[in-house]
């Protein structure tokens, strides 16, 4: 049988409260936003040549959080490092890319100046999921 | 990653036993009943992301990148986050009180570095 | 050392209530689960259900939901059991257990109450 | 629920004969989560064998418990007068967690 006294949260109300909604100006709790970004601007356009710009998705937002707010995990959803740590005081949870979760970048690159070109993946470079941990 | 060592400020990985008596999880975390979790802290200062093994990943320089050039250096925190989990076996009650034995992913800090 | 103290016997009339105590002495209580256990004269062993000292939580088995009301007071060290609308099935000598933790993830009710012993009579 | 059943229900042996119970469950049970336990008239429990195979504090070495998935067994290698009460396996690993009906052994 199910617990008779409820848990505070349930996994999918964990879910929301670590990945919350993706638009900036809903609030300002950690969340994942937009820039669109030319490597032209990095001074990375003699490398990568195409695409010139890209779609660069970064995680933003604060990570406070009051002590009798914590999600508590229920029966069946495993704790994350980060949760228990809102109780440690040097530990202060940073609004950033979840690890393991980054995308690659396709990009078509040259090293001699355009006289030739390849196709390559620039690692870890697009942020899929924004948590405080 | 760095360890800390109580002399360094840079972003490092700071040993912590996570008691789960005290955060009143041990009534449905069968075992252990604690463990290290260890957890990240310290500073991210922007050259940090040029040293081997400080910098989490390929978007971290891309952020750097930005700053340096003063583009946009507002919305963007440089963090000191995980780099490196590991698993831990756990023994815990699912949400119908079965009794699951896992290894459950991403539970104890390894190694930190500037996001 | 580790003791479960519960009382000897309860008398209870038909439909009344009976609410059995198991105190707890000998080690940390809010760390364990306490567990209940029903035995009928000459009869098996049936689990009814557990409690939590630390959060409070319960967990019933399914048959007894209804009839058993598990409830803490950690200042005391006591875990109660309250059971309702008795009948003449529910006489039977009521176990309280600890559930403990035997090492490398093996866990049992490793200490017992002597047990109550409740008769539901008019 | 997983339904634990014990047989015999009651047995009888001689003194110094080995004797085996067994416990069969309706659906597959983990071997960590197998107890026995052991029961004197008048009397609580007692935790006799967990985990399948590990003798609890101060049972003797005659007894010993084997099994997997839906079979369990308790044996005693050679039979002795304070051995014949009841025994009960139990598991824990599906809610509700349940008991056999137990075997009561008597001696001969």
């Known amino acids: 049988s199910a617990p008779s006294m409820p848990w505070p949260w349930s996994p999918a109300a964990l879910r929301l409260l670590q990945r919350p909604p993706e638009e900036p100006s809903a609030h300002a709790f950690c969340h994942r936003a937009a820039l669109n970004i030319s490597f032209q601007e990095l001074g990375w356009d003699r490398w990568i040549v195409h695409p010139p710009s890209f779609i660069f998705h970064y995680c933003h937002g604060s990570c406070g959080m009051p002590t009798s707010d914590l999600p508590l995990p229920v029966p069946g959803a495993p704790p994350t490092p980060a949760q228990p740590l809102f109780l440690v005081p040097g530990a202060k949870p940073c609004c950033a890319a979840l690890p393991g979760s980054m995308r690659s970048l396709r990009v078509r690159t040259t090293s001699d100046g355009g006289y030739s070109f390849k196709y390559e993946m620039v690692p870890n470079l697009i942020t899929q999921h924004c948590a405080c941990i | 990653g760095l360890e800390c060592d109580g002399r360094t400020s840079l972003c490092c990985r700071q040993q912590f036993f996570i008691d789960f008596r005290l955060i009143g999880w041990n009534d449905w975390i069968i075992a252990p009943t604690g463990y290290y979790g260890n957890y990240c802290e310290g500073s991210c200062p922007a050259y940090l992301a040029g040293v081997p093994g400080s910098a989490s990943s390929f978007h971290t320089a891309v952020v750097n990148q930005y700053r340096m050039r003063g583009l946009n250096p507002g919305p963007v925190n440089s963090c000191c986050i995980p780099t490196k989990l590991s698993s831990m076996s756990m023994l815990y009650f699912d949400d119908e009180y079965n009794i699951v034995k896992r290894d459950v992913p991403n539970m104890i800090v390894e190694e930190c570095g500037c996001a | 050392q580790v003791q479960l103290q519960q009382p000897g016997a309860e008398l209870v009339k038909p439909g009344a209530s009976v609410k059995l105590s198991c105190k707890a002495s000998?080690?940390?209580?809010?760390?364990?689960?306490m567990y209940w256990v029903k035995q009928r004269p000459g009869q098996g062993l049936e689990w009814i259900g557990m409690?939590?000292?630390?959060?409070?939580?319960?967990n019933y088995n399914g048959k007894f939901k209804t009839g058993a009301t598990l409830t803490v007071d950690k200042s005391s060290s006591t875990v109660y059991m309250q059971l309702s609308s008795l009948t003449s099935e529910d006489s039977a000598v009521y176990y309280c257990a600890r559930w403990g933790y035997g090492g490398n993830y093996d866990y049992a009710m490793d200490y017992w109450g002597q047990g109550t012993s409740v008769t539901v009579s008019s | 629920q997983i339904v634990l059943t014990q047989s015999p229900a009651i047995m009888s042996a001689s003194l110094g004969e080995r004797v085996t119970m067994t416990c069969t469950a309706s659906s597959s049970v983990s071997s960590s989560y197998f107890h026995w336990y052991q029961q004197k008239p008048g009397s609580s429990p007692k935790l006799w064998i967990y985990s399948t195979s590990n003798l609890a504090s101060g049972v003797p070495a005659r007894f010993s418990g084997s099994g997997s998935g839906t079979s369990y067994s308790l044996t005693i290698s050679t039979m002795e007068a304070e051995d014949a009460v009841t025994y009960y396996c139990?598991?824990?690993?599906?809610?509700?967690?349940?008991f056999g009906g137990g075997t009561k052994l008597e001696i001969k």
């Open positions: 409690i939590h000292p630390n959060s409070g939580s319960t």
């Open positions: 139990h598991q824990y690993h599906r809610s509700p967690w349940t």
């Open positions: 000998g080690y940390t209580f809010t760390n364990y689960w």
